[in-house]
Amino acid sequence: MKVLQEPTCVSDYMSISTCEWKMNGPTNCSTELRLLYQLVFLLSEAHTCIPENNGGAGCVCHLLMDDVVSADNYTLDLWAGQQLLWKGSFKPSEHVKPRAPGNLTVHTNVSDTLLLTWSNPYPPDNYLYNHLTYAVNIWSENDPADFRIYNVTYLEPSLRIAASTLKSGISYRARVRAWAQCYNTTWSEWSPSTKWHNSYREPFEQH
């Protein structure tokens, strides 16, 4: 039994880091493998993660962490029984994938303005809480070409757009994702999408 692709890990910078790797053949990850992880920290203790299968030869492990700070560094040991298959380390602050925003809501009752709001996925005491920026994706269910991205570079989790920038009388969907420049993170997953029917009063045209 050998590791074909070494574990790579990403952290949500709160409580979970996810490590994925591939073995050289079909493996029952949960029964054959264990990933031990330990904070490099005086008198810390090792923890065991039981991996799950992620495709035939792929494994994934969700490492539970009690908060994350920038100095954190973990040692990782992948075991198959008594055999050490791989040894490495992981610094969560250098491999951050933020949590996805939630509770995306489209408010359509503000004159002819669409107000989109969502929730910051972090509690106020987490470092990322004040460092997230967002991308909002809006698209038409009827027209695949009607697809747009709005970059929200301010901290407030909201976006206002004129309803008239979208077509009237058709349905749209929106979703939002987050990233943090401070840690050069990857983008989060997209939030679940929300749907609304776009309608607004056409301005009276004079000829």
Epitope: L39, V40, F41, L42, L43, S44, E45, D66, D67, V69, S70, A71, D72, N73
Partner: antibody
């Protein structure tokens, strides 16, 4: 309420021994690394020793290595510091301290301290 | 072994003023953790800041920590009468624990 209560301090002659105890209440001792920190009269804080939650690893400051032994009895929620070959410079208030992993070495709960005096 | 040096040794200020306390490490400690404590006469120390900049539970927001590498700072934005005490920085690393010698913050 989370509390640490030290006992066992007193007056001892140079070369003598003493055993300090620390009774924990309000939390499960085995979930935390525990430490001893001391403070000589009119001086600053000095780290003495620590032990992991499962007793698998211990650590000692160079000044006490080979003379002091830290241990714990998790079922009884008690931490110990066995001190031998005591010297005048070991005279201090000894604090029992809890380290919460979330606090990354920040010592969030301190006992009130027990005084050890080494003198002839 | 890493040495932490605090400055100044004594800081004399008045209530309402801003206090800036320094803690310098003898080598880079970016892979370790820095904490700050307050100690009043006859009392055990109290944890104020951990992980360089995070306030411990119940600590007022006038206390803040910052720094990286070898230079760290504890700032008290507006001194209250109860803030006059001795302050210690502490390093907790992979292989050792060290305290600074302390800064006494006294009323001017």
């Amino acid at each position: 309420e989370v509390q640490l209560l030290e006992s066992g301090g007193g007056l001892v002659q140079p070369g003598g021994s003493l055993r300090l105890s620390c009774a924990a209440s309000g939390f499960t001792l085995s979930s935390y690394a525990m430490h001893w920190v001391r403070q000589a009269p009119g001086k600053g804080l000095e780290y003495v020793s620590g032990i992991s939650g499962n007793s698998a690893s211990t650590y000692y400051a160079n000044s006490v290595k080979g003379r002091f032994t830290i241990s714990r009895d998790n079922p009884k929620n008690t931490l110990f510091l066995q001190m031998s070959s005591l010297r005048a410079e070991d005279t201090a208030v000894y604090y029992c301290v809890r380290v919460k992993l979330k606090y990354r070495g920040g010592m969030d709960v301190w006992g009130q301290g027990t005084t050890v005096t080494v003198s002839s | 072994e890493i040495v932490l040096t605090q400055s100044p040794g004594t800081l004399s200020l008045s209530p309402g003023e801003r206090a800036t306390l320094s803690c310098r490490a003898s080598q880079d400690i970016s892979s370790a953790y820095l904490a700050w404590y307050q100690q009043k006469p006859g009392q055990a120390p109290r944890l104020l800041i951990y992980g360089t900049s995070r306030r411990a539970t119940g600590i007022p927001d006038r206390f803040s920590g910052s720094g990286s590498g070898t230079d760290f700072t504890l700032t008290i934005s507006r001194l209250e009468p109860e803030d006059f005490a001795v302050y210690y920085c502490q390093l907790y690393g992979a292989t050792s624990v060290t305290f600074g010698q302390g800064t006494k913050l006294e009323i001017k």
